[in-house]
Amino acid sequence: KEVVLLDFAAMKGELGWLTHPYGKGWDLMQNIMDDMPIYMYSVCNVVSGDQDNWLRTNWVYREEAERIFIELKFTVRDCNSFPGGASSCKETFNLYYAESDVDYGTNFQKRQFTKIDTIAPDEITVSSDFEARNVKLNVEERMVGPLTRKGFYLAFQDIGACVALLSVRVYYKKCPEMLQSLARFPETIAVAVSDTQPLATVAGTCVDHAVVPYGGEGPLMHCTVDGEWLVPIGQCLCQEGYEKVEDACRACSPGFFKSEASESPCLECPEHTLPSTEGATSCQCEEGYFRAPEDPLSMSCTRPPSAPNYLTAIGMGAKVELRWTAPKDTGGRQDIVYSVTCEQCWPESGECGPCEASVRYSEPPHALTRTSVTVSDLEPHMNYTFAVEARNGVSGLVTSRSFRTASVSINQTEPPKVRLEDRSTTSLSVTWSIPVSQQSRVWKYEVTYRKKGDANSYNVRRTEGFSVTLDDLAPDTTYLVQVQALTQEGQGAGSKVHEFQTLSTEGSAN
């Protein structure tokens, strides 16, 4: 933005500048150009020897300017366009200035003036240029500063040129008031802080309903000496409940919301929320729908899931595999987990109680993501009821629970766990174990073994203890071994078939 302090052309000859010597040299003339009157200060004493003609402006109030720009529009006539030339003719003039705190009026003293520059035309008007208004207009600009006094004068010294001064415009530059990144920057005088710091740093203020983002930098701009804004730093963002519309922050419309200061527009209220009012920062959930603490406000409100589907309990000796499928209604969430609880009942007394402490789960039963789990260490001749509950992120916000139950009766003991204790070239020492709670029900253990690959014959040994040594075996041979508990009711669950190998005659024991 240019703030004009003096504009000769705009004043239509009314300024009345001082000429020195009075009545000689510079002369105010009116001409017609393109049917319009134009005023100019002109001098053409090219045949009059050495010249020292001064033209001084009126006193110009400096206002806030620190450096001023002087734009001159002028015409200089070619010295060769005069008959026979003109020996004392020049084609330049000098520009001066003087600062003062008061207007000296007609008191003109050359010594108070400081030379700014010699003004030379880029183009001179030669005689062939006179046709069709082809008068070469030169534009020159000079900068002066820093200024410190209340005002100043400019002066033009003619040293024998044929020159017409058509326009003298003096202005200073301001960076205009500006809205940028939702920040308002005030009109600022364009001034260099120093030679090394040619930019003035200006802090902006956020527009209504805009804020500096948390942890962010406040808005700053740099005003150059040329009156241009440069290098924006930081920004303002529309606060919660408001969105950016052009250079302002506007309240979110009803049915929309914005939860935080951001560049984002207002969002439509998500599913299962009540319509918001103007300027809403969130949308309330419908009755029966909830938001988990970690749910973003842009997410639909959700509800707890329904119970798992198709729960089955498959007994395998003293183990049960529980399987189920996901709930029909997830409540609109993906974060479903399952909890398994266990209850055991004694058939004789009908007495029941929790059994979490006495059974073992294949994985922790309270945050299952898969839809199956194996429960082991179940006691024979006991009735078990398993409840599988489906939960999601909002289940904790309601008291009701969504679960399905399955019951199973355990008749068999759990299969023994078998291991090889020792071996030699002709023998294998085998031990096993079963849960302590089931041991009282076992009458004997039956050990079946045979050579691997020999499907036609096998041997059986019975014992009441938890170990047996199988003798008269062939060296370096693999045997298939299985242990089965025998109860009063018949055979219990058999162990899996193990492969054990005797030592070779070259090998030593172990």
């Epitope: 053409c44 045949v47 009059s48 200089v76 004392s88 005689s127 008068v135 044929c162």
Partner: antibody, heavy 121, light 106 residues
């Protein structure tokens, strides 16, 4: 006020010389060039040239070189036109005129009353 | 040398009428040549010079225009004192006059 004063009519014989004075008043004589213009009886104007009153340097138009001389006496603010070897066709009114120079063009803004020079045997 | 041709040689007008005088150059010359008025027995008088600048004391019914080779002096409403001979003059390194146009009472 600004004035250019010329001498009265002159009658000369062919081959003779004449010196026509032009005395300036009302302004600084050396600040403006002086032109000379000839007007033959019943004819139009002819520009003869000018003299730089500051340096005394003359400029002659085509057809006015040789017999025509412009000169000055700045002490009495007077310009002179001297014509030698007069011919019958030199019979005319001779005007001095102050030159007005501007960036946008030139003119002669103050004229003497003219001096009639008659060349006749 | 540039030749200036003025037309018409004689222009008959009644007082109060508009008079238009033409000045044509043999080649492009200075814009808006100078114009002079000469009455019988008198020295010429400068009317207009430069960019159509009227000389001191010249009434505004006199105006000049034109460019290149064709120039015009216009007297918007001829007054009795305007009947005279009018000359155009081009400037530059050499000056020349037109042969003149006589404005007479119709």
């Amino acid at each position: 006020q600004v004035q250019l004063l010329q001498s009265g009519a002159e009658v000369k014989k062919p081959g003779a010389s004449v010196k026509v004075p032009c005395k300036a008043s009302g302004y600084t004589f050396t600040s403006r060039a002086m032109s000379w213009v000839r007007q033959a009886p019943g004819q139009g104007l002819e520009w003869m040239g000018w003299i730089n009153t500051n340096t005394g340097n003359p400029t002659y138009a085509q057809g006015f070189t040789g017999r025509f001389v412009f000169s000055l006496d700045t002490s009495v603010s007077t310009a002179y036109l001297q014509i030698s070897s007069l011919k019958a066709e030199d019979t005319a009114v001779y005007y001095c005129a102050r030159v007005r120079l501007t960036v946008y063009g030139d003119g002669m803004d103050v004229w003497g009353q003219g001096t009639l020079v008659t060349v006749s045997s | 040398e540039i030749v200036l041709t003025q037309s018409p040689a004689t222009l008959s007008v009644s007082p109060g009428e508009r008079a238009t005088l033409s000045c044509r150059a043999s080649q492009s010359v200075s814009s808006n040549p100078a114009w002079y008025q000469q009455k019988p027995g008198q020295a010429p008088r400068l009317l207009i010079y430069g960019l159509s600048t009227r000389a001191t004391g010249i009434p505004d019914r006199f105006s000049a225009s034109g460019s290149g080779t064709d120039f015009t002096l216009t007297i918007s409403r001829v007054e009795p004192e305007d009947f005279a001979v009018y000359y155009c003059q081009q400037y530059g390194p050499s000056w020349t006059f037109g042969q003149g146009t006589k404005v007479e009472i119709k």
